[in-house]
Interface confidence: low
Amino acid sequence: GCRALEETLMDTKWVTSELAWTSHPESGWEEVSGYDEAMNPIRTYQVCNVRESSQNNWLRTGFIWRRDVQRVYVELKFTVRDCNSIPNIPGSCKETFNLFYYEADSDVASASSPFWMENPYVKVDTIAPDESFSRLDAGRVNTKVRSFGPLSKAGFYLAFQDQGACMSLISVRAFYKKCASTTAGFALFPETLTGAEPTSLVIAPGTCIPNAVEVSVPLKLYCNGDGEWMVPVGACTCATGHEPAAKESQCRPCPPGSYKAKQGEGPCLPCPPNSRTTSPAASICTCHNNFYRADSDSADSACTTVPSPPRGVISNVNETSLILEWSEPRDLGGRDDLLYNVICKKCHGAGGASACSRCDDNVEFVPRQLGLTERRVHISHLLAHTRYTFEVQAVNGVSGKSPLPPRYAAVNITTNQAAPSEVPTLRLHSSSGSSLTLSWAPPERPNGVILDYEMKYFEKSEGIASTVTSQMNSVQLDGLRPDARYVVQVRARTVAGYGQYSRPAEFETTSERGSGAQQLQEQLPL
């Protein structure tokens, strides 16, 4: 516990004039001047009516104001003569005296009131010396402390009852105890009076010291009956931007150049790389110009920057598709969350006067266009004989924080002529016992002027193929067997060569006994 404080309500040691307490009967206690152990002059009371039996001598102090105190302590200094050392005394000689108190709301006592007896006076204790003395000049001073309470009225009197002792009351001090204001767990607790009983625990509410915050509530400390603090409950801790100092009684602001991101008892730390503070009490260090923190970065992480451009972009064009490959940037910006984006631009016009615009949505990127972790991408569905610019951007977790666009490396390419794409679905317009009339849509991507179409067909049961060429996107196949199934495929041709065949489709000729041609039969997929 912490040191207890004692506050005096009354102390005879400092009284130099008469005490003028009330004694009853007047032949009992007598006020005399004397000296304390340090030979300072003091006022004392003595009684020594030992040769007379049936003594009942009372002494009452002046009125003592209570000051909201619930329990009062009385320190008595006295000497007692050893009954055996006094000649010619009856057996009623005592070596003890009694301590009483009486509560009142004002100074109402008189020579006859309250009545000189236990009840109305409240007995505190019978006081016995540790040592009595046999010779008048060799008196040993006894010191005794007693307490009483709870008190409720405005003040009280102390009273001393002698029943036949030879003694001197050297000093009387009435005081109370309180717990001194203290700092514990970064919280301040005020000076607090002790409770009504020696075992009482008085709750003192706490407040966090400056620059501290509560970490557990409620904040309280208990003041015990001896004026000592015990059982702390709750605690504060230094707020962000502050560190413990002066044996945990202060929270000191972090000096410039340091910070503390979390509340607690940890110290301020130097700013992480690429950051600084310009004022004290920083909970985070601000990033240097062109350095940033991502939203997911903690306050104690270094500030980082955007990556430099990718290096060594290589293109490998194959007709209307290409593969781009590149190397890692020289500078990753201090981060490990590097990604790549590939921006496609289609260019029109010649040389330096060309204008470029974003590519069409049908351009395909494998594995993807944005957020690549790989340093390779396959790009297809480009237009033939067209100039393109591809920008390979390097980005990381702070690219979105930078006001500047991502850094990139660009490569210019021109596509070659490509063969036409696949012919879509074939349709049957009519069939007879010996012929099939078919049509089809041109390829989605002709990649040039279509010169003609080649059709491959065979009877399903035989598998020997025949071919026929058509300048139009329809054809009539003649000389077929009746009631037979035929598998048909078509492909388109440009100057770049043939495209891929369409998917195989099945059609049937009609029976010879049928009544003419059957119209618009749907294709039968394999």
Epitope: V213, V215, S216, T240, K262, Q263, D295, S296
Partner: antibody, heavy 121, light 112 residues
Amino acid sequence: EVQLQQSGAELARPGASVKMSCKASGYTFTSYWMHWVKQRPGQGLEWIGYINPSSAYTEYNQKFKDKATFTADKSSSTAYMQLSSLTYEDSAVYYCAREGKYGSYYGLDYWGQGTSVTVSS
Amino acid sequence: DIVLTQSPLSLPVSLGDQASISCRSSQSIVHSNGNTYLEWYLQKPGQSPKLLIYKVSNRFSGVPDRFSGSGSGTDFTLKISRVEAEDLGVYYCFQGSHVPWTFGGGTKLEIK
């Protein structure tokens, strides 16, 4: 006084989407993260994820990654959660809850009254 | 995912009794920063959950001191020293140390 006021009950068909709101008052909306919690009828609580209204940074429970989308409107101090491709399993009460911090995290300290979602054909 | 197992599922008590609820995690829930983000919530019938305890043993503002939390690593306990009528409901433990954050299955505190 801190308050989180959630939007009213929703009735939706399987496959549809719903978007519920959580309006914050009594504190600085952008200073505290907002969490979402699911409670099926008569069941326990399930954490869906959270959003930082200041930066729109989100973190989802993987289980709800394709189900829930969090957004926040700083001007109206309102957090939103959209649930998509609803199934009967999504019928539940959904709570928004503020993540308390006083220098450091101390729990989900204030909760909305909940929005009931019923999926029925 | 970390699984929090609460026991018992149901806890019948008399008013004034002490109640104790256990919460066990499938692995340690000490965060890399050294804190243990284990909380306790109470959900009364027809109401939203309310925070009681955070970081294992810290009582949230306004929570009576008859509620106390303890434990470390994987074993945690909520104690109510003298149960009052207003304490009845379902108690959930919750960990916020590792994503996804998870709740325990709940313990229903009811009158015997």
